[in-house]
Interface confidence: medium
């Protein structure tokens, strides 16, 4: 059998195989050692007994989408049946005091591979016995502690495979420079040691995407905005836009990145090299936010121009590729920074990302202030309590509710929260009366809210003993 017979039914075209060469991967035309690595079809009854105590599930994830030229990382994690885990030696053991359907196990091991390998690897001094090989016959790499790695992972995509010895979790990174744009399929088959052979325990597949667009996401934050995820924001308050570029392999780390913003409110275009920008909308309505991200990413170099004919010079190629600049001066000549174009030189190519959102701008409560606090005299039966009136003003829209949170002087331990609807006039002046149990210093958080906004002000107040002569003080 060949690898492609074992690993996948989807056969890439000859063109795909030729143009998607993955560095360090091998062609799936290679032979598969079925004696050491038996092949079971889906539904084969032997799968039921491939693992003691149930089935092992393999979970395959990737950090897709990947910008072409960057590295994409695949991670496979094995999930064992209940109560089983891998120990420090790579053996599979039962978790202590864990009860599954079979009850508590007397034997601590599900698979004691340490014992197996001591028995079976004695035939030569190197430990490189005929069975310590991958499905294509290549020997296992002898990393320190390799004997504790008891799972063999075979990754398969684009007509190529990659073999890896590992524990219950492995990661493989692939450079996407030669990968065709669009969705691709990665398949992984996992085997476990079984004496002097191997047994398949899991198969999993996942789609990954290679793109020539920079993957871009924008988070938006605005003070006083009640719900930051509904893309509704308040007029006359700055919104902070933060651009997140999905670049897990740090491919763009050395790129100059430009962010070009159009806020849709006729304020023109704004170009920045900073991933955050603040913008204030001064009108209500619906606006189309557009962002173009541009980066010079490492990319293929253009072919060197042919040597000029003696009669007239050949103009050089007009292209969006840029020669990668080095920190060393260029060769002498009339260009102080001329950089030669050699075939394997690292060049730069413009890459773009786009983000679009429709945001709604509405009136909201912009600001809230406590302008006065008055101690209200209490009748004699409540000598320990103080009533305090807070006179509050606000700017912006008219609030419909008020909440006060009374807490300790550090503003961390809440003692009392009271919310109530309010009916406020156009001037936005209201009085909020609250009770304080006993003297001392309190932190008061006062929020005014409506459907779309929530404005906060805080103050520390000092409530005196119930001596009528003691004045109420703002502690801050």
């Amino acid at each position: 059998k060949r690898f492609h017979d074992v690993l996948g039914n989807e056969r890439p075209s000859a063109y795909m195989r030729e143009h998607n060469q993955l560095n360090g991967w091998s062609s799936d035309e290679n032979d598969w050692n079925e004696k050491l690595y038996p092949v079971w079809k889906r539904g084969d009854m032997r799968w039921k007994n491939s693992w003691k105590g149930g089935r092992v599930q393999a979970v395959l994830t990737s950090d897709s989408p990947a910008l072409v030229g960057s590295n994409i990382t695949f991670a496979v994690n094995l999930i064992f049946p209940r109560c089983q885990k891998e120990d420090a030696n790579g053996n599979i053991v039962y978790e202590k005091n864990c009860r599954n359907e079979a009850g508590l196990s007397a034997d601590p091991y599900v698979y004691n591979w340490t014992a197996w390998s001591e028995d079976s690897d004695g035939e030569n001094g190197t430990g490189q016995s005929h069975h310590n090989v991958f499905p294509d016959g290549k020997p296992f790499p002898h990393h320190p502690g390799w004997r504790r790695w008891n799972f063999i992972y075979v990754f398969h995509t684009l007509g190529q495979y990659f073999q890896k010895l590992g524990r219950c979790s492995v990661r493989v990174s692939v450079n996407t420079a030669n990968v065709t744009l669009g969705p691709q399929l990665m398949e992984v088959t996992v085997y476990r040691r079984h004496g002097r052979a191997y047994v398949p325990i899991a198969q999993v597949k996942d789609v990954y995407v290679v793109t020539d667009q920079i993957p871009v996401f924008v988070t938006m934050f605005q003070k006083n905005d009640r719900n930051s995820s509904d893309e509704t924001f308040l007029k006359d308050l700055p919104i902070m836009f933060d651009v997140l570029i999905h670049d897990p392999s740090h491919f763009l780390n050395y790129s100059t990145i430009n962010y070009k913003w159009s806020f849709g409110d006729n304020t023109g275009l704004f170009v920045s090299t900073n991933h955050t920008v603040n913008h204030t909308y001064v009108l209500n309505g619906t606006f189309s936010l557009n962002l173009t991200v541009k980066a010079a990413a490492p990319g293929p170099c253009p072919p060197p121009p042919p040597p000029p004919r003696p009669s007239k010079p050949t103009p050089s190629l007009a292209t969006t590729l840029k020669s990668y600049d080095s920190n060393t001066p260029g060769p002498a000549g009339d260009n102080p920074l001329e950089l030669s174009r050699i075939p394997d030189e690292n060049c730069q190519i413009n890459r773009y990302g786009h983000f679009q959102a429709t945001i709604t701008i509405v009136e909201g409560i912009l600001e809230v202030n406590i302008i006065q606090m008055t101690d209200v005299l209490m009748p004699v039966p409540w000598p320990e309590s103080s009533l305090i009136d807070f006179v509050v003003t606000c700017q912006g829209s008219i609030p419909t509710e008020v909440c006060t949170i009374i807490s300790d002087p550090t503003c961390e331990i809440t003692q009392n929260t009271v919310c109530s609807p309010v009916d406020v006039d156009e001037m936005c002046l209201l009085t909020v009366r609250r009770t304080f149990n006993g003297s001392g210093t309190y932190c008061v958080n006062l929020t005014l809210g409506d459907d779309t906004s929530l404005a906060l002000t805080s103050t520390l107040i000092s409530v005196p003993d119930r001596d009528p002569a003691s004045p109420l003080r703002m502690a801050n």
Partner: antibody
Framework: QVQLVQSGAEVKKPGASVKVSCKAS????????MGWVKQRPGQGLEWIGA????????NYNQNFKGRVTMTVDTSISTAYMELSRLRSDDSAVYFC???????????????WGQGTLVTVSS | EIVLTQSPSSLSASVGDRVTITCSAS?????MHWYQQKSGTAPKLLIY???NLASGVPSRFSGSGSGTDFTFTISSLQPEDAATYYC?????????FGGGTKLEIK
């Protein structure tokens, strides 16, 4: 050799517009950003903005935003800088300068045009 | 924007002197460039990326520094070095220039 040749001096009235050109030769025009710099008589240098000729991606200094427009014509390797709503303090020499590849911070303006004097006077 | 403060704003030195100009950035930058401008002409790049000599520029010119403090040095002043010298940063938009140092020969 690399050369940047700018258009001639201009005299404009306040409120008018001026368009300065910068013709590049001796290198691949689309390989480098083209920046524009203002210098008032006896004063220092002020960066106006830059354009990437490969795709006309522009970047303007906020001080000039809304009044400046940078364009290119790649067929004749020429960059243009248009300044509108001219004021008396726009009287200055305007230089075009070739920036490093893709606006890289490693390379400042390595080649400069000879400058174009713009006089704004009523 | 990043403000570049150049000092001194002017200086007078004799032929053969060692001349040093400093440029301080309001926040940290990766690369500083230095230009020479003679009266009525365009600026000319002398030093790029802090310490690299542009081609055709005599080796008596040098640059150094990092972060916020950068230095430009002429090791042995020549009569043709009389000019105004500018530091500049292309690291952060808008690109900015120092106020200039006018160098006269005594």
């Amino acid at each position: 050799q690399v050369q940047l040749v700018q258009s001639g001096a201009e005299v404009k009235k306040p409120g008018a517009s001026v368009k300065v050109s910068c013709k590049a030769s001796g290198y691949t025009f689309t390989d480098n950003w083209m920046g524009w710099v203002k210098q008032r008589p006896g004063q220092g240098l002020e960066w106006i903005g830059a354009i990437d000729p490969s795709d006309s991606f522009t970047n303007y200094n906020q001080n000039f935003k809304g009044r400046v427009t940078m364009t290119v014509d790649t067929s004749i390797s020429t960059a243009y800088m248009e300044l509108s709503r001219l004021r008396s303090d726009d009287s200055a020499v305007y230089f075009c300068t070739r920036s490093g590849y893709y606006g890289s911070p490693k390379l400042g303006g390595d080649y400069w045009g000879q400058g174009t004097l713009v006089t704004v006077s009523s | 924007e990043i403000v570049l403060t150049q000092s001194p704003s002017s200086l007078s030195a004799s032929v053969g002197d060692r001349v040093t100009i400093t440029c301080s950035a309001s926040s940290s930058i990766s690369y500083m460039h230095w230009y020479q401008q003679k009266s009525g002409t365009a600026p000319k790049l002398l030093i790029y990326s802090t310490s690299n000599l542009a081609s055709g520029v005599p080796s008596r010119f040098s640059g150094s520094g990092s972060g916020t403090d950068f230095t430009f040095t002429i090791s042995s002043l020549q009569p043709e070095d009389a000019a105004t010298y500018y530091c500049a940063q292309w690291n952060s938009y808008p690109c900015t220039f120092g106020g200039g140092t006018k160098l006269e020969i005594k």
